[in-house]
């Protein structure tokens, strides 16, 4: 059946609508569109003749209509007057007519609404407020939003006037929110700007902060008053009933016992005309002295000296407290407190014990802290490190060595070559070196305060020829699918290229192989048994090259699932049963057997002479690799037939 679908059905003014034709008959002569529910020549919009593939505008054509060859009609720039019915008249080749009618409705695009209010400053628990959504629009739906949420259910909220008016009875401060109204029709929805309801309230009973009521003589008294109020409250302070000042904060410096008494804060709201007061009682006590720390050793030596820190002055019936690095004391056998907690002893100090240390005296009101004390722990020197780490140099380059040792006070450095003192500096520089500069380079670090010295020796070889390199490994027996191995080519030499070979071939491309450290280090991730190969590293510079001896990687793996041979599972009574178990494993696994769950011997081969049907059952071989910590097993069923029968052998 011929039908017309309007897309969309509800159209906004200025937009477009498509009258879509469904089930258009075959073999047409042509078709025409008419405004209205019937065919009326005076209201023809458009005609289309199939034979000429040409359309003709009718009297009702406005220039905004476009007809498509599939008979659908597009109307653009829709106006209000376009609302209504449209009839398609189809003339078939047999001159039999068919008609279908469709319709759409036109709605205006809504303007942005606004909110008017009958009371801009309602008073809490007293006034009502009526919000009205403007303008009044026909065929529009009105919605309200509070803080971008739909209206809550409340007996104090009432909608009226077709939801255009929202009334809040007996407003509270919680009604201070963002209110929006929304107008909707089938083609548009618009929201107003927010209106913030300004509810006048308070003042509530004021709160005085801080809450503590006990103070020490000499402190500053700083009281702040706050009362919930809109508009903000005006504040007044009274001490023992006597007016002091009209401020939110009351400040009295350097108080004495005489400042003890009752302190009253009064809050006043000029718009509501209400007053509220709160009273707090302040007590001022005489002040104890500020503590300080004394030490029996201001420059203790690491791992040698103990230090006793004492909290002064000594006061009877007083609790002493200690802090290290702004934390309470950690539990440590090297920290000891005296019975009265006044003395803290550090046994065998380390460089990490520098502090800062604070002690405190607990009194009735608070804790008085000392100034922090920092220990000057003498330590070192540690073993010096010589950088850079190169040991091979080419003739003609400059040799620049730097020495560093952790030390307090900082170490003094000396350099020796082959035991002969050179200079007393942290850095050693020799320009344009030759083979004669090869030798033992010693850095000596000396701590003048502790009297300790430490040395480090480095062998420097100056040669145009590179040495034969060697490979060091961080893991001599890696486990398959678990470990990584890092090979490093030694020595580290300046201006040198590092190369690697596996089984005499250059490195294969693999995501499990990674070169780093200037190609000096070759890392194999997640090693497999196939990585058990010969690895060679090579070094080369512009004048020479050399290769290391091969290092074979010993990968621990397995045991894999064992195999029991022979594969036969059926035997004749009286035969010998000789089962051998094998599992791929490195190192070789330990073997054990179970028959029907009962442990047998710990051998690779299980031998039973002259078997009978009593030997029927499950034969399990267990393998265990102690190095990888992995186990595996396999079970085989054996059937023994009486010698009179002739069973078919099965694998």
């Amino acid at each position: 059946k011929l039908t017309i679908e309007s897309t969309p059905f509800n159209v906004a003014e200025g937009k477009e609508v498509l009258l879509l034709v469904h089930n258009l008959p075959q073999h047409l002569f042509g078709y025409s569109w008419y405004k209205g529910e019937r065919v009326d020549g005076n209201r023809q919009i458009i005609g289309y003749v199939i034979g000429t593939q040409q359309a003709t505008p009718g009297p009702a054509y406005s220039g905004r209509e476009i007809i498509y060859p599939n008979a659908s009609l597009l109307i653009q720039n829709i106006i209000q007057n376009d609302t209504g019915f449209y009839t398609l008249h189809v003339i078939k080749s047999d001159l039999v007519n068919e008609e279908a009618t469709g319709q759409f409705r036109v709605y205006p695009e809504l303007p942005k609404p606004s909110i008017s209010s009958n009371n801009s400053k309602p008073v809490e628990d007293k006034d009502a407020v009526a919000f009205t959504c403007e303008p009044e629009t026909q065929d529009a739906t009105y919605l309200w939003w509070v803080n971008n949420q739909s209206l809550p259910v409340s007996p104090r909220l009432q909608l009226s006037n077709g939801n255009r008016t929202l009334t809040l009875f007996n407003v509270t401060r919680n009604d201070t929110a963002s209110y929006k109204c929304e107008t909707q029709n089938p083609v548009s929805a618009r929201r107003s700007d927010s209106v913030i309801l300004n509810v006048l309230y308070g003042p509530d009973a004021p709160t005085i902060s801080p809450l503590n009521t006990s103070y020490r003589s000499g402190e500053n008294l700083n009281l702040s008053c706050h009362a919930a109020s809109n508009p903000p409250a005006q504040y007044s302070w009274f001490v023992n009933g006597t007016f002091q000042q009209s401020t939110q904060e009351l400040f009295i410096p350097n108080i004495t016992v005489n400042n003890s008494g009752s302190y009253t804060c009064q809050a006043h709201n000029s718009d509501t005309g209400l007053n509220r007061t709160t009273v707090t009682t302040i007590t001022v006590y005489a002040e104890p002295p500020k503590p300080f720390i004394t030490s029996n050793n201001s420059n203790p030596v690491e791992d040698e000296d103990a230090v006793a820190l004492t909290c002064e002055p000594e006061i009877q019936n007083t609790t002493y407290l200690w802090w290290v690095n702004n934390q309470s004391l950690p539990v440590s056998p090297r920290l000891q407190l005296s019975n009265d907690n006044r003395t803290l002893t550090l046994l065998s100090v380390t460089r990490n014990d520098v502090g800062p240390y604070e002690c405190g005296i607990q009194n009735k009101l608070s804790v008085d802290h000392s100034d922090p004390v920092i220990l000057n722990v003498l330590y070192g020197p540690d073993d010096p490190t010589i950088s850079p780490s190169y040991t091979y140099y080419r003739p003609g380059v400059n040799l620049s060595l730097s020495c560093h040792a952790a030390s307090n006070p900082p170490a003094q450095y000396s350099w020796l070559i082959d035991g002969n003192i050179q200079q007393h500096t942290q850095e050693l520089f020799i320009s344009n070196i030759t083979e004669k500069n090869s030798g033992l380079y010693t850095c000596q670090a000396n701590n003048s305060a502790s009297g300790h010295s430490r040395t480090t020796v480095k062998t420097i070889t100056v040669s145009a020829e590179l040495p034969k390199p060697s490979i060091s490994s961080n893991n001599s027996k890696p486990v398959e699918d678990k470990d990584a191995v890092a090979f490093t080519c030694e020595p580290e030499a300046q201006n040198t290229t590092y190369l690697w070979w596996v089984n005499g071939q250059s490195l294969p491309v693999s995501p499990r192989l990674q070169l780093s450290n200037g190609n000096r280090t070759l890392t194999l991730f997640n090693v497999t048994r196939n990585d058990a190969r010969a690895y060679v590293c090579g070094i080369q510079n512009s004048v020479s090259a050399n290769r290391s001896d091969p290092v074979t990687l010993d990968v621990l793996y397995g045991p894999d699932t064992p195999i029991i041979s022979p594969p036969d599972s059926s035997y004749l009574s009286g035969a010998n049963l000789n089962l051998s178990c094998h599992s791929a494993s490195n190192p070789s696994p330990q073997y054990s057997w179970r028959i029907n769950g009962i442990p047998q011997q710990h051998t690779q081969v299980l031998f039973i002479a002259k078997i009978t049907p009593n030997n029927n059952g499950t034969y399990a071989c267990f393998v265990s690799n102690l190095a990888t910590g992995r186990n595996n097993s396999i079970v085989k069923s054996i059937t023994v037939s009486a010698s009179g029968t002739s069973p078919g052998l099965s694998a």
Epitope: G51, Q53, Q54, T56, P57, G58, P59, P69, N70
Partner: antibody, heavy 118, light 113 residues
Framework: QVQLVQSGSELKKPGASVKVSCKAS????????MNWVRQAPGQGLQWMGW????????TYAQGFTGRFVFSLDTSVSTAYLQISSLKTEDTAVYYC???????????WGQGTLVTVSS | DIVMTQSPDSLAVSLGERATINCKPS????????????LAWYQQKPGQPPKLLIH???TRESGVPDRFSGSGSGTDFTLTISSLQAEDVAVYYC?????????FGQGTKLEIK
């Protein structure tokens, strides 16, 4: 966008045949009629006729019957003009032009020059 | 058949000046029932296909500069270029699509004086 692309220039001898193609893109070929227009060198536009792309029915203008054939291959969205027994006076630029739904011609192909010379 | 006659055959106008081309169908191309004139104007520049400028005798095609305008009804039509530009040099054709066979005018060549 809606576009008509015609085949390239042709040089033919008298008595030969030529087939000019017009490929439509950006719309469905069968929705709009296709006109053919001739323009002889230095001359005006001469309407040769049109083909109803929906039914395949051709209409030829006076003077363009017999040797001129309009055809379609809707599977490749292409209209064709075939001229047989070419004469030197058939030398011209041949245009295909889509018949707009109201009857005017828009757009036009870029034209195909057919030169008939012995 | 409707015969279309254009005048003049050629026209030379100074840049910025008005150019006027006339077109006379041998019979009316006004369809009374919708009051539409079935006449179009085309512009053809050298080496290019014709381009639709105006349809329904006076409706400018989108993208056509507003210095081009069409007027007239029945059997008398005019294409006007209000201020000639260098790029307007072309041959201009009128065409009726009122009845089959549709027909073109012989063309008017517009040049710059």
């Amino acid at each position: 966008q809606v576009q008509l692309v015609q085949s390239g220039s042709e040089l033919k001898k008298p008595g030969a045949s030529v087939k000019v193609s017009c490929k439509a893109s950006g719309y469905t070929l069968t929705d709009y009629g296709m006109n053919w227009v001739r323009q002889a060198p230095g001359q005006g536009l001469q309407w040769m006729g049109w083909i109803n792309t929906n039914t395949g029915n051709p209409t030829y203008a006076q003077g363009f019957t017999g040797r001129f054939v309009f055809s379609l291959d809707t599977s490749v969205s292409t209209a064709y003009l075939q001229i047989s027994s070419l004469k030197t006076e058939d030398t011209a630029v041949y245009y295909c032009a889509r018949k707009a739904i109201w009857g005017w011609f828009d757009p036009w192909g870029q034209g195909t020059l057919v030169t008939v010379s012995s | 058949d409707i015969v279309m006659t254009q005048s003049p055959d050629s026209l030379a106008v100074s840049l910025g000046e008005r150019a006027t081309i006339n077109c006379k169908p041998s019979q009316s191309v006004l369809y009374r029932s919708n009051n539409k004139n079935y006449l179009a104007w085309y512009q053809q520049k050298p080496g290019q296909p014709p381009k639709l400028l105006i349809h329904w005798a006076s409706t400018r095609e989108s993208g056509v500069p507003d210095r081009f305008s069409g007027s007239g009804s029945g059997t008398d039509f005019t294409l006007t270029i209000s201020s000639l530009q260098a790029e307007d040099v072309a041959v201009y054709y009128c065409q009726q699509y009122y009845s089959t066979p549709c027909s073109f005018g012989q063309g008017t060549k517009l040049e710059i004086k």
